[in-house]
């Protein structure tokens, strides 16, 4: 296997992470996509602390993070717990809003402009912030 | 310099395999997420399938998924397509393609012909 | 997916022109665009990327804009190494998918 011991050009380096923030919008699976083809996810917040310094980086933009509800219940798409994991939503949200009147409810989540999190259509064209683990080995699949 | 190298192409039969490679070098290949797009005789350009850098996440056209696979063997610096179940319309020229943030292609390997006939 | 279409699909013109493609999207793709030009027997080469953005290299006469939708590459003091064919790519959403190609061709 291989292992990341520093950032890539043009990402930021915090706690032993690499960050990239876009400065162009994507619907959610398309931000997911663009993440995962640079071997990231998007971000997932596990503390308060990593909630501050995304927030610093993003500004007051609504800005995608890796936590959807797409298949059901909250997940984080590393596998991290919700449940049990940090929260950071706005008063009265997650609330899968229907009046948006662009069919069903709403299943990603996002920053708003003052950090805390809401809910929104995943079509919706935000910004969105990657994030890989420095010192993660990662196995290299077998050749077929 | 970088430099992408195609090879493996050639006259195959349909529902025949082939196994297209891509030599890269002059970057660190291992840091950068590759493609192969390929342009039918005459025709314009299609992206066939993206991969990771470390190779962890692949995608595909929906025209060859099921039938090809996108490798990469970064210890040798190399990008594969296996080709399998080939059609008439696969034929084409197949370019390897390194990526720039933003997934463009900044570079391009000279191509490879890949020709799918009885 | 995501179709793009060029206009025109060629184009007449002449050394020290102003040549103009437009590039059109299904659906929005912000600036998620790139050009390409490619000659005959060759690799295609990127020129554009973000939609604006000048490849490391290439010349200053060619230049893109547009956001969204719809997009432009202009060829401005066309010289006799620009005769080609361009085309167009989005990146916003997997497949990524290319125009059809515009054929600039001498006068």
């Known amino acids: 296997g291989s292992e990341r011991t520093c950032c890539p050009v043009n990402w930021v380096e915090h706690e032993r992470s690499c960050y990239w923030f876009s400065r162009s919008g994507k619907a959610w699976a398309d931000a997911d996509n663009y993440c995962r083809l640079e071997d990231a996810h998007l971000v997932v917040v596990t503390s308060w602390e990593e909630q501050k310094f995304v927030q610093h980086h993003i500004g007051p933009v609504n800005t995608w993070m890796g936590l959807h509800d797409q298949n059901g219940p909250w997940k984080w798409v590393d596998g991290t717990d919700y449940e049990t994991g940090f929260k950071n939503w706005r008063p009265e949200q997650p609330d899968d809003w229907y009046g948006h009147g662009l069919g069903g409810g709403e299943d990603c989540a996002h920053f708003t402009d003052d950090g805390r999190w809401n809910d929104d259509v995943c079509q919706r064209p935000y910004r969105w912030v990657c994030e890989t683990e420095l010192d993660k080995a990662s196995q290299e699949p077998p050749l077929l | 310099e970088v430099q992408l190298l195609e090879s493996g192409g050639g006259l195959v039969q349909p529902g025949g395999s082939l196994r297209l490679s891509c030599a890269a070098s002059g970057f660190t290949f291992s840091s950068y997420a590759m493609s192969w797009v390929r342009q039918a005789p005459g025709k314009g350009l299609e992206w066939v399938s993206a991969i990771s850098g470390r190779g962890v996440n692949t995608f595909d056209a929906d025209s060859v998924k099921g039938r090809f696979t996108i490798s990469r063997d970064n210890s040798k610096n190399t990008l594969y397509l296996q080709m399998n179940s080939l059609r008439a319309e696969d034929t084409a020229v197949y370019y390897c393609a390194k990526e720039r943030s933003g997934s463009y292609f900044d570079y391009w390997g000279q191509g490879t012909l890949v020709t799918v006939s009885s | 997916d995501i179709q793009m279409t060029q206009s025109p699909s060629s184009v007449s013109a002449s050394v020290g022109d102003r040549v103009t493609i437009t590039c059109r999207a299904s659906q929005g793709i912000s600036d998620w665009l790139a050009w390409y030009q490619q000659k005959p027997g060759k690799a295609p080469r990127l020129l554009i990327y973000g939609a604006s953005s000048l490849q490391s290299g290439v010349p200053s006469r060619f230049s893109g804009s547009g956001s969204g939708t719809d997009f432009t590459l202009t060829i401005s003091n066309l010289q006799p190494e620009d005769f080609a064919t361009y085309y167009c790519?989005?990146?916003?959403?997997?497949?990524?998918?290319f125009g059809q190609g515009t054929k600039v061709e001498i006068k």
């Open positions: 790519q989005q990146t916003n959403s997997f497949p990524w998918t």
